[in-house]
Each structure stands twice: as C-alpha cells, then as structure tokens.
Interface confidence: medium
C-alpha cells in the first residue's frame, strides 16, 4: 500500500521524494504526478524537473529543498480537501529498462479550531527498509533494489517510523533515497 | 545478455484468432513492463499493448481493442498476445519490447491474416 | 495516420550532418519524452536516444536528439554509408495513454 502523508486544511503539505545525483550537477528528470504512478511518464502531471531546471510546474506545486543535490520532495501550498489522493513521484533513470516510482498517499484533515503553525507536517508512515538486491523491484511497488545498468551502489528506504517532523532534518530521512554512482 | 523472442505467427484466416508468445532471458522479467509494436509491411511502427510488471496496468491502441489481450507469466518469464477475430490490416511482423523506455526489442514474428 | 510527423525521407553525403524532425502536440512531445529508433533493412528497431536525448551503451555520439516545445528532432553527423535506415520517433501519449510513433523517415546515404 501507498506511504502515508498528513496535512490540515490550509496548511502546505509535503511529500518527500529523494536521490543522489551520481555527480554535482548531473540530475536525473523526476516528474510529480496526480494519481498512482502509470506504467508510462506521471498521469496528470503536477511539477517535471530536467537534467538543469523545474521546466514544468502548475500553481501551489513546488520543490522547496535542493533539487539540485537530488530533494525532489513536492511541496503543495494552502492545501484543500480536493488535494487529499495519491501523488507519483517518478525518478526517470536513463539508460534502463524501469524508472523509480512512488506512490505517495496524502490525507487532507479538517483545520482545527487553533491551527497548527504551517510548516509542520504529520507523517504517520514511512517507507519500509529494504537493502540493495540482484535486479529492482516491481514498478507498482515502493521496494526497490540495485540497477547495474547505471552503475547504483545503493537504492536504500530510510526510517521505519518519522518520529518527530517538526525538525527539518528528518524530512528527508522519510523518503525514498536513491543514490546512483 | 537481454534477449526477446517472439512466437505463434503463422497464416491465419480473417475471423480466426492466434497467440503470440515472447520468451525473456537475461534480465528479472517480473521486475519490467512489456509492451507489443507491430509493423505492416512496408509501413511504420505501431504501438499494439503495454502490461506493467505485475500486471496492474494494461494499455492497448484503438485499433486492437477488444479483439487482443495482452498477459504475462512472470515464473516463466514469457509475454503474451492472445489475437482474436483478426483481420486482413493485422497482418505484420510483430514485435515484444522491454521496459519503460522500449530500449529491448525482439527479432519479431510474422502474422500473415489472409483468406 | 501516424500521431507524430516526420519528414518521409531525408539524404546526405558521407561526412554531412543530417536532421530528421518530428513534430506532435502538447500531450506527447510537449508534455513527454521522445525516443528515436533506427530500423536497419531487414531488423528489428533499436533505441537510439532516450530520456533528456541521452544514448543507450553502444550508441555512436554521432547521434543526438533534441526536443523544444512540440518538435522534437535528430542529428546525425558524420554520415556514413551503414546509417542508412529508417527511423522513428515515439513518445507516450498522456492524453490517448497510449505509445505513438511517428510514420518513419528513410535515410538515403548518396
């Protein structure tokens, strides 16, 4: 099943999305994606990044980290109810067979009477732990493994369990981090 | 190294039905999406099915649909395109090829519809 | 009717750079990723450049795509005989979900 993400109404929410460029500068294309992640490309696609820039974005949609040193994390401003769904995260690997996908589930809640400050985010869930193994996993899944084809050392899902997101430091231990190189 | 080989085309009847088969090795077939292209002769490529990896999704053009079925036995490593009610325009040479970038192909397996 | 455009044939002298274009709409080369193949007599198609126009292994640079917009095209420098082959372009569809190619351009090496 999809990972799990929280926002309130009103709130910007965050779905994080990871990997290491192989070197500064070379950048894998990540398209972002309203809907579960498709066989091919990102269904209604939201935020697209190249090998220099974001060259595709709509409104509320945007990468606050450094997607230059591989954060393509979604960040969605002023969220409604209407954005509650699965979200795709795609890392367009080139030179192999499959790319990386993510389906990310986000759950809008009601605003509360004293709402909470704006950057902080409720993860309930966390990718699970997997180690590198012979070939990579099914393109409908979050399990991932080793692609020889582009020389990955290391595809590798981080934290069992967010336990405290209001440091920004862990936003990043929440999601799928791939590194290539 | 990554092969594709395609069978089952033959000479068929209009109205009759054939199943194509494609034999992976080389790679982890379940980890992939496959997808079928065919090419008439001395025309173009074109575009038959997808299947994602554990079958979950599944595409196929206009032309075809409701007359093909594509599947997939991922513990023998083999794609399929079940054919029915063919007619005289699907006659080509058809063609399985891997992944999300289509980088794989096979050597293809001719389907002649013919009274 | 191919979804894509291409140019039905296109010639040059060895040594020449060639362009081959392919032209579609905003739901699949605007939107997507163009994928060029070369189809030599007689073979079956094989990728030439894929995502951000990069080149599978074994893919001479001599080859290199690019895309602006809704036109996507391919340059061949340094032609030589042995590139003398149809090619195609393709690219996922969002609107149809579906592949779709263009009708093929035949190279003539003079």
């Known amino acids: 099943s999809e990972v799990e993400y929280r926002a309130e109404v009103g709130q910007n929410a965050y779905l994080p999305c990871f990997y290491t460029p192989a070197a500064p500068g070379n950048l894998v294309p990540v398209c972002w994606g309203k809907g579960a992640c498709p066989v091919f490309e990102c269904g209604n696609v939201v935020l697209r990044t190249d090998e220099r820039d974001v060259n595709y974005w709509t409104s509320r949609y945007w990468l606050n980290g450094d997607f230059r040193k591989g954060d393509v994390s979604l960040t969605i401003e002023n969220v409604t109810l209407a954005d509650s769904g699965i979200y795709c995260c795609r890392i367009q690997i080139p030179g192999i067979m499959n790319d990386e996908k993510f389906n990310l589930k986000l759950v809008i809640k009601p605003a509360k009477v004293t709402p909470a400050p704006t950057r902080q985010r409720d993860f309930t869930a966390a990718f699970p732990r997997m180690l590198t193994t012979r070939g990579h996993g099914p393109a409908e899944t979050q399990t991932l493994g080793s692609l020889p084809d582009i020389n990955l050392t290391q595809i590798s899902t981080l934290a069992n369990e967010l336990r405290d997101s209001r440091l920004a430091n862990d936003l990043r231990d929440s999601g799928a981090t791939i590194r290539i190189g | 190294q990554v092969q594709l080989v395609e069978s089952g085309g033959g000479l068929v009847k209009p109205g009759g039905s054939l199943r194509l088969s494609c034999a992976a090795s080389g790679f982890t077939f379940s980890s992939y999406s496959m997808n079928w292209v065919r090419q008439a002769p001395g025309k173009g490529l074109e575009w038959v099915s997808s299947?994602?990896?554990?079958?979950?999704?599944?595409y196929y053009a206009d032309s075809v649909k409701g007359r093909f079925t594509i599947s997939r036995d991922n513990a023998k490593n083999s794609l399929y395109l079940q054919m029915n009610s063919l007619r005289a325009e699907d006659t080509a040479v058809y063609y399985c090829a891997s992944g999300d970038h289509m980088d794989v192909w096979g050597q293809g397996t001719t389907v002649t519809v013919s009274s | 009717q191919p979804v894509l455009t291409q140019p039905p044939s296109a010639s040059g002298t060895p040594g020449q750079r060639v362009t081959i274009s392919c032209s579609g709409s905003s739901s699949n080369v605007g939107t997507n990723y163009v994928y060029w193949y070369q189809q030599l007599p007689g073979t079956a198609p094989k990728l030439l450049t894929h995502?951000?126009?990069q080149r599978p292994s074994g893919v001479p640079d001599r080859f290199s795509g690019s895309k602006s917009g809704t036109s996507a095209s391919l340059a061949i420098s340094g032609l030589r005989s042995e590139q003398e082959a149809d090619y195609y372009c393709?690219?996922?569809?969002?609107?149809?979900?579906?592949?779709?190619f263009g009708g093929g351009t035949k190279l003539t090496v003079l």
């Open positions: 299947i994602s990896s554990s079958s979950s999704y599944i």
């Open positions: 393709a690219a996922w569809d969002a609107t149809l979900s579906a592949w779709v």
């Open positions: 995502i951000n126009n």
